[in-house]
Interface confidence: low
């Protein structure tokens, strides 16, 4: 028997991936555990092997289909179970009725690029990845810029309250190296959370023209 508190959290990327983390105090050692996904009204079911990510937590990704296939909808419900092997049998450690569109976490934005850079401003664009067409334009973004001598945690957040896949950064310092990140979140879903931050995009502002005031 396993004692201690168990926490089982999963998110749907809105297309064909459910990512799960299971943590268990008084953790199981050297035990094989899986997440089983059983949709209530779909022909398929899926399993993934939980792999350790820390002393007492495991993670895995349920791959439901090709990355851009729409495998679930807002009225689907998926029974997710954590099953761990005990000798010759499997024991259920956790269960949840998973509502995919109430538990969304999209993939990080991709294809960040500098569209135009000047001395004091920079226009940056990006793309969303594997996001459902169901959202239409109901997405929001957060962005942050890393300035020299600061950490990401200190960077102020800029919020874009609409589906806008570009930003114009203003009041930058000339001839300075910056990094930029963006993340996305659907407006739908009680337990929906922000995507991971995108890979940082490094850029440098243009130097000020000689003899001119900056």
């Amino acid at each position: 028997a396993v004692n201690g508190t168990s926490r089982f959290t999963c998110f749907y990327n809105s297309r064909a991936n459910i990512s799960c983390v299971w943590s268990q105090d008084g953790a199981l050692q050297d035990t094989s555990c899986q997440v089983h996904a059983w949709p209530d009204r779909r022909r398929w079911n899926q399993t993934c092997e939980l792999l350790p990510v820390s002393q007492a937590s495991w993670a895995c990704n349920l791959i439901l289909g090709t990355p851009d296939s729409q495998k679930l909808t807002a009225v689907d419900i998926v029974t997710l179970r954590v099953m761990c092997r005990e000798g010759v049998r499997w024991r259920m450690m956790a269960i949840q009725d998973f509502k995919p569109f109430e538990n969304l976490r999209l993939m990080a934005p991709i294809s960040l690029q500098v569209v135009h850079v000047e001395t004091h401003r920079c226009n940056i664009s990006w793309k969303i990845s594997q996001a459902s067409h169901y959202f239409e334009r109901h997405l929001e973004f957060e962005a942050r810029t890393l300035s020299p001598g600061h950490t990401w945690e200190e960077a102020p957040l800029m919020t874009l309250k609409q589906k806008q896949e570009w930003i114009c950064l203003e009041t930058l310092t000339p001839d300075t190296q910056y990094e930029f990140q963006v993340r996305v979140k659907p407006l739908q879903g009680e337990f929906t959370t922000w995507s991971p931050w995108s890979q940082p995009l490094a850029f440098r502002t243009k130097p000020a023209a000689l003899g001119k005031d900056t």
Partner: antibody
Framework: EVQLLESGGGLVQPGGSLRLSCAAS????????VHWIRQAPGKGLEWLGV???????DYNAAFISRLTISKDNSKNTVYFQMNSLRAEDTAVYYC?????????????WGQGTLVTVSS | DIQMTQSPSSLSASVGDRVTITCQAS?????LYWYQQRPGKAPRLLIY???NLASGVPSRFSGSGSGTSYTFTISSLQPEDIATYYC?????????FGQGTKVEIK
Amino acid sequence: EVQLLESGGGLVQPGGSLRLSCAASGFSVTSYGVHWIRQAPGKGLEWLGVIWSGGSTDYNAAFISRLTISKDNSKNTVYFQMNSLRAEDTAVYYCARAGDANYDGFAYWGQGTLVTVSS
Amino acid sequence: DIQMTQSPSSLSASVGDRVTITCQASQSVSFLYWYQQRPGKAPRLLIYDTSNLASGVPSRFSGSGSGTSYTFTISSLQPEDIATYYCQQWSTYPLTFGQGTKVEIK
């Protein structure tokens, strides 16, 4: 063979409560959601709510304040409770289950149980 | 809520006739079902996911459509087809049914 059998219908006083049972056989209620649908005399079908395999529920918002769906996995039985009944709740109440295939609708129905709300 | 409007509400046709019922949704739906209900009986699933025939259902029944407009057809009406037919959406909660179409034999 999948079967659903409702029971608990009958005459209920206005303002009273109703508790119906849906005994499932041929499948486990830990693997499938069970829905409740009703039909007033001479009228159409109205979806009331569902209890999913893991025990969570979805209700028709029009009934959420007076409806509770629960289940006893050990008895493989689902329960339907509605409070503050009025004459317009008079109906045949069905439990139903979706089939196995992709989005295949209510493939299995109980025979229904008649509830009459009257003084 | 999504309103499902069936037409006609009733019809009378001869044995062997082709019968068509339409179902209009108040907004676009992804998954549509058709049920047959004979008097005093529980509904029976005929068509799932717009156009797929449920198990054991004769091939004279068919369904088609997309978005907000759907059609149910009986290619050759038989005496045992006397019943009320309902459409139903399973795209958003609450799940909703059409008001029904009563089919009678002339």
